[in-house]
Interface confidence: low
């Protein structure tokens, strides 16, 4: 969470950004809010990126002005125009690329004053894991798969019954490059598992942490997955 203050004569407004992460190949949002101003035509929003000449996006007089937009963002950006008057300056970024990572500035000018705040935008790939009973294994095993990760994550297994156990000796993890030659498919197999237990497959890189749980009893299999972005305010 970053809060910036701007001063215009005696007038300043608070601008707030949130560190966030983009999943490459998907759409992302760079979050920015400011003190609302009901005079839409008096609001100017500018998004800038460190190291890039030209603007990422500009919104003024109630509409987009892309005359100074840098070519790497052409056709890929939009603000939530209907939410600008209530103080939402967030930027929608289509088809997130690895190169979109960096420091962005959200600059706001309204009839009340002006202000800005920076945010760090991380890019990578992250996806939910799925755990299955591997019926085709020679011994009872679980297979954890997640289709898209970048950078290469770490994978760890945990068990509700054997809390604190080190499963590295009885698991095997592989990373398979996907067709676009950036992201990778993660596959981890845990061997010699027992019934009446809950196992967790945890996949983590510096952008996200995902956990898949599987509860195996003598009469049922239940699954649950969750994904958490790291260092996002």
């Amino acid at each position: 969470l970053i809060i910036g203050f701007g001063i215009s004569g005696k007038h300043f407004i608070t601008v707030t950004t949130f560190t966030s992460a983009g999943n490459i190949g998907e759409d992302g949002t760079l979050s920015c809010t400011f003190e609302p101003d009901i005079k839409l035509n008096g609001i100017v929003i500018q998004w800038l990126k460190e190291g890039i000449k030209g603007l990422v996006h500009e919104f003024k007089e109630g509409k987009d002005d892309l005359s100074q937009q840098h070519e790497m963002f052409r056709g890929r950006t939009a603000v939530f125009a209907d939410q600008v008057v209530v103080g939402n300056a967030s930027l929608r970024l289509k088809n997130v690329q690895l190169t979109d990572a960096g420091t962005y500035t959200c600059y706001i000018r309204t009839s009340k004053g002006k202000g800005n705040a920076n945010l760090e935008y991380k890019t990578g790939a992250f996806s939910m894991p799925e755990i299955n009973v591997d019926y085709n294994a020679s011994s009872e095993s679980l297979r954890c798969e997640a289709p898209r990760w970048f950078p290469q994550p770490t994978v760890a297994w945990a068990s509700q019954v054997d809390q604190g156990a080190n499963f590295s000796e009885v698991s095997n993890t592989s990373f398979e490059l996907n067709s676009e030659n950036v992201t990778m498919k993660v596959v981890s197999v845990l061997y010699n598992v027992t019934i009446n237990n809950t196992y967790s497959c945890m996949i983590e890189n510096d952008i996200a942490k995902a956990t898949g749980d599987i509860k195996v009893t003598d009469s049922e299999v239940k699954r649950r997955s969750q994904l958490q972005l790291l260092n996002s305010g």
Epitope: Y135, A137, S138, V216, E220, V221, R223
Partner: antibody, heavy 116, light 107 residues
Framework: EVQLLESGGGLVQPGGSLRLSCAAS????????MHWVRQAPGKGLEWVAS????????YYADSVKGRFTISRDNSKNTLYLQMNSLRAEDTAVYYC?????????WGQGTTVTVSS | DIQMTQSPSSLSASVGDRVTITCRAS??????LNWYQQKPGKAPKLLIY???HLQSGVPSRFSGSGSGTDFTLTISSLQPEDFATYYC?????????FGQGTKLEIK
């Protein structure tokens, strides 16, 4: 040729017992999980029970839990279904099927009739 | 338990027709959906596994699609041997459940 062959079906009175067998051939039986699926006359398919390759995981449908027992003998390449306390609603054709990507190999079925 | 609902329950069509059967799960099953064909007096036969993967030996006129809760089996050009009953089945979690079946008849 990959094959599953069920046997052991027949006519039994309510409350009685039967043991179905499924003989596997043409593949490494010990590497695959197995299922039992049944089909009542004129009705659809109903999953009954599953067992994993080394018998570590066993699952049952609620309708048979406590009455049916699935087991396997990998040395004999055979799957079993022990059925106790049989009811009229257990009347069906019972199929064994191999657990792979879907139930990819099925037996021809054996008929169980529960009637007095 | 996850309920699987197929539609239609029965369907009349002619040789050469394109036919679509749908299957809806009562909650998400990701792509854990299989399709089977059954002819009278015979065991079911696996056609499609994991929602869209054609089982080895199955003609390419059969195809599957969908994920989450809504799935489709399509036969692009009906052949005489395709008249049968079709079942969907989820393998996401126990109890593994089948749809009630769709009977495909000759018009």
């Amino acid at each position: 040729e990959v094959q599953l062959l069920e046997s052991g079906g027949g006519l039994v009175q309510p409350g009685g017992s039967l043991r179905l067998s499924c003989a596997a051939s043409g593949f490494t039986f010990s590497s695959y999980g197995m299922h039992w699926v049944r089909q009542a006359p004129g009705k659809g398919l109903e999953w009954v029970a599953s067992i994993s390759s080394s018998s570590g995981y066993i699952y049952y449908a609620d309708s048979v839990k406590g009455r049916f027992t699935i087991s396997r003998d990998n040395s004999k390449n055979t799957l079993y279904l022990q059925m106790n306390s049989l009811r009229a609603e257990d009347t069906a054709v019972y199929y064994c099927a191999r657990a792979s990507s879907g139930m990819d190999v099925w037996g021809q079925g054996t008929t169980v009739t529960v009637s007095s | 338990d996850i309920q699987m609902t197929q539609s239609p329950s029965s369907l009349s069509a002619s040789v050469g027709d394109r036919v679509t059967i749908t299957c809806r799960a009562s909650q998400t099953i990701r792509s854990y959906l299989n399709w089977y064909q059954q002819k009278p007096g015979k065991a079911p036969k696996l056609l499609i596994y994991a929602a869209s993967h054609l089982q080895s030996g199955v003609p390419s006129r059969f195809s599957g699609s969908g994920s989450g809760t809504d799935f489709t089996l399509t036969i692009s050009s009906l052949q005489p041997e395709d008249f049968a009953t079709y079942y969907c089945q989820q393998s996401y979690t126990t109890p593994y459940t089948f749809g009630q079946g769709t009977k495909l008849e000759i018009k």
